[in-house]
């Protein structure tokens, strides 16, 4: 058993049918010695008396808020949560496996630049009695500071018969140098509590590996005289690291017809302009990627050919 | 993804082309190592990230863009002395800081070159003959060093009398390649920045 926060305790259980569970001793936080009784949750049934209460915690029915009283007055509370270990592996019931970029990906994180600021998000089908707490650091043995905000509900989607809820959090490394070469990964730890179930999820990454630039901005077309060709131009996104000559991007320019089946013409360039043939009803899209370290491509910025 | 090959103009900063070739070569070598050594811990998540140049050179600090010198987090600089007679830039433009930066890059390349050559000698003794260093990568390191044209004492190649542990050598190769790729990215950024300025 360990303390998650004041008066909230996590009991770790090897989870299988007929498991013996864990013996837990609760102590009433009071100078009183006599006439103390214990109850669980809203029940008035007295579970025991005395300054300490010994219980065998086996299932969720044994978890909850234990309260010690004296003469109708509440002295203190202890909330017991359960953390299930199923055949050596901690349960992951609360969050959905996003399966991207690989199986067992519960937390996904992205950064728009090298400033040390990043966003993480996760999915769940649970709508109520759910709380999250996020901590982060650079490295784990001698951790350096990363400050995270509160996790917030950022999106709701309908997936078949189920509703899916997306939560996200923003974090900022306390003293980040955009040019630094990372040797210790960022660690993100999310505590999740649903009713009386506790779970924790972790993700470990280098900022360089989660970079996804914003799409190029100010995408414009300039027709070339007496030609079906157009000059496409764009700019680096505002959120990208500066100076741009050091943090350079490379770009992919795509001409896409109305029909998804039509052949796509693609050009790769390091410049912020390109000359392409604009077909009728086609659209021109441009996306960006770090020129020197191949992390994710940005989303597309698009304009119609007409 | 193959990086676009830039053909430098005659007046262009001559090291940019070499640094792009270097990044391409080390990225290809790392990809090859990860595929060939799939049963070894060779991914970024599995290896320890060691920097053989730590406390010996200070490339990131010495080559910091002017715009980032205001960022206090970037200025935990280490005192390092370097030879300053580089030839990558037209001599008029070679400021003291630039020379310091380029000589730091040169020292990095020299250190990695020695490590890679020592390692290749061990890998050539492996009866499995599973993986060797790409000669193209070694050649590209050499070309960039020549373009930088710094005079510096030659570091003797390390020779080891004991029987090599091939498993450890292959893991060390992965560690070195990951670190060298990160340094090659920094070198490319620096060359691009110097070329623009």
């Amino acid at each position: 058993i360990w303390e998650l926060k004041k008066d909230v305790y996590v009991v770790e259980l090897d989870w299988y049918p007929d498991a013996p569970g864990e013996m837990v001793v609760l102590t009433c936080d009071t100078p009183e010695e006599d006439g103390i009784t214990w109850t669980l949750d809203q029940s008035s049934e007295v579970l025991g008396s005395g300054k300490t209460l010994t219980i065998q915690v086996k299932e969720f029915g044994d978890a909850g808020q234990y309260t010690c009283h004296k003469g109708g007055e509440v002295l203190s509370h202890s909330l017991l949560l359960l953390h299930k270990k199923e055949d050596g592996i901690w349960s992951t019931d609360i969050l959905k496996d996003q399966k991207e970029p690989k199986n067992k990906t519960f937390l996904r994180c992205e950064a728009k630049n090298y400033s040390g600021r990043f966003t993480c998000w996760w999915l769940t089908t649970i709508s109520t009695d759910l709380t999250f707490s996020v901590k982060s650091s650079r490295g784990s043995s001698d951790p350096q500071g990363v400050t995270c905000g509160a996790a917030t509900l950022s999106a709701e989607r309908v997936r078949g018969d189920n509703k899916e809820y997306e939560y996200s959090v923003e974090c900022q490394e306390d003293s980040a140098c955009p040019a630094a070469e990372e040797s210790l990964p960022i660690e993100v730890m999310v505590d999740a509590v649903h009713k009386l179930k506790y779970e924790n999820y972790t993700s470990s990454f280098f900022i360089r590996d989660i970079i996804k630039p914003d799409p190029p901005k100010n995408l414009q077309l300039k027709p070339l005289k007496n030609s079906r060709q157009v000059e496409v131009s764009w700019e680096y996104p505002d959120t990208w690291s500066t100076p741009h000559s050091y943090f350079s991007l490379t770009f992919c320019v795509q001409v896409q017809g109305k029909s998804k089946r039509e052949k796509k013409d693609r050009v790769f360039t390091d410049k912020t302009s390109a000359t392409v043939i604009c077909r009728k009803n086609a659209s021109i899209s441009v996306r960006a990627q770090d020129r020197y370290y191949s992390s994710s491509w940005s989303e597309w910025a698009s304009v119609p050919c007409s | 993804r193959n990086l676009p090959v830039a053909t430098p103009d005659p007046g262009m900063f001559p090291c940019l082309h070499h640094s792009q070739n270097l990044l391409r070569a080390v990225s290809n070598m790392l990809q090859k190592a990860r595929q060939t050594l799939e049963f070894y811990p060779c991914t970024s998540e599995e290896i320890d990230h060691e920097d053989i140049t730590k406390d010996k050179t200070s490339t990131v600090e010495a080559c910091l863009p002017l715009e980032l010198t205001k960022n206090e987090s970037c200025l935990n600089s280490r005192e390092t002395s370097f030879i300053t007679n580089g030839s990558c830039l037209a001599s008029r433009k070679t400021s003291f800081m630039m020379a310091l930066c380029l000589s730091s890059i040169y020292e990095d390349l020299k250190m990695y070159q020695v490590e890679f050559k020592t390692m290749n000698a061990k890998l050539l003794m492996d009866p499995k003959r599973q993986i060797f260093l790409d000669q193209n990568m070694l050649a590209v390191i050499d070309e960039l060093m020549q373009a930088l044209n710094f005079n510096s004492e030659t570091v003797p190649q390390k020779s080891s009398l004991e029987e090599p542990d091939f498993y450890k050598t292959k893991i060390k190769l992965c560690i070195l390649l990951h670190a060298f790729r990160i340094r090659a990215v920094t070198i490319d950024r620096v060359m691009s920045y110097l070329n623009a300025s």
Partner: antibody
Framework: QVQLVQSGGGVVQPGRSLRLSCAAS????????MHWVRQAPGKGLEWVAF????????YYADSVKGRFTISRDNSKNTLYLQMKSLRAEDTAVYYC????????WGQGTMVTVSS | SYVLTQPPSVSGTPGQRVTISCSGG????????VKWYQQLPGTAPKLLIY???QRPSGVPDRFSGSKSGTSASLAITGVQAEDEADYYC????????????FGTGTKVTVLG
Amino acid sequence: QVQLVQSGGGVVQPGRSLRLSCAASGFTFSEYGMHWVRQAPGKGLEWVAFIRYDGSNKYYADSVKGRFTISRDNSKNTLYLQMKSLRAEDTAVYYCKTHGSHDNWGQGTMVTVSS
Amino acid sequence: SYVLTQPPSVSGTPGQRVTISCSGGRSNIGSNTVKWYQQLPGTAPKLLIYYNDQRPSGVPDRFSGSKSGTSASLAITGVQAEDEADYYCQSYDRGTHPALLFGTGTKVTVLG
């Protein structure tokens, strides 16, 4: 004590369907994940499928994906395996089993796919 | 489709020490715990070892398990006639958990 009692096995022609059941007692069935495992005559153990405690997630072996469906009815304390498009290579003893470091197995039920 | 490899058979005379190996990889045994089962003819498998080296109550102490790196082994010290059975190791793969990964199985024969 924990008990898993299986039923539903038998002889079936290729291409036909069969549903296996596993009735659980002696524990809070709705709190535990469950597996199906099979064993072809004279062969080793092969995992078939898994279902989470609340039925929210199901996992299948590639060899049965798209043909077999694992399900559970927590109000009836029963686990099911719906098998469709049966093949000769599905002939085996099928076991249900609890998920955990200590597990409990059903007695097994024989499924024979033969024309 | 078996990723955990066991010897097809091992044998020993009563009182001898018999060991069965189970060889896997970094993504299965290397990152997860191992179980061992005993299966007597015509019966369901019985758990012998869990969490690599733990014995459930009721399992004789002549059975012991160990794990090192990407391999595990089961030892029967002082093998007895009633130990003649099939033995299976089981683990998980970190990419496909909770799918059970079984070993190929080993037939233990007690001679004489």
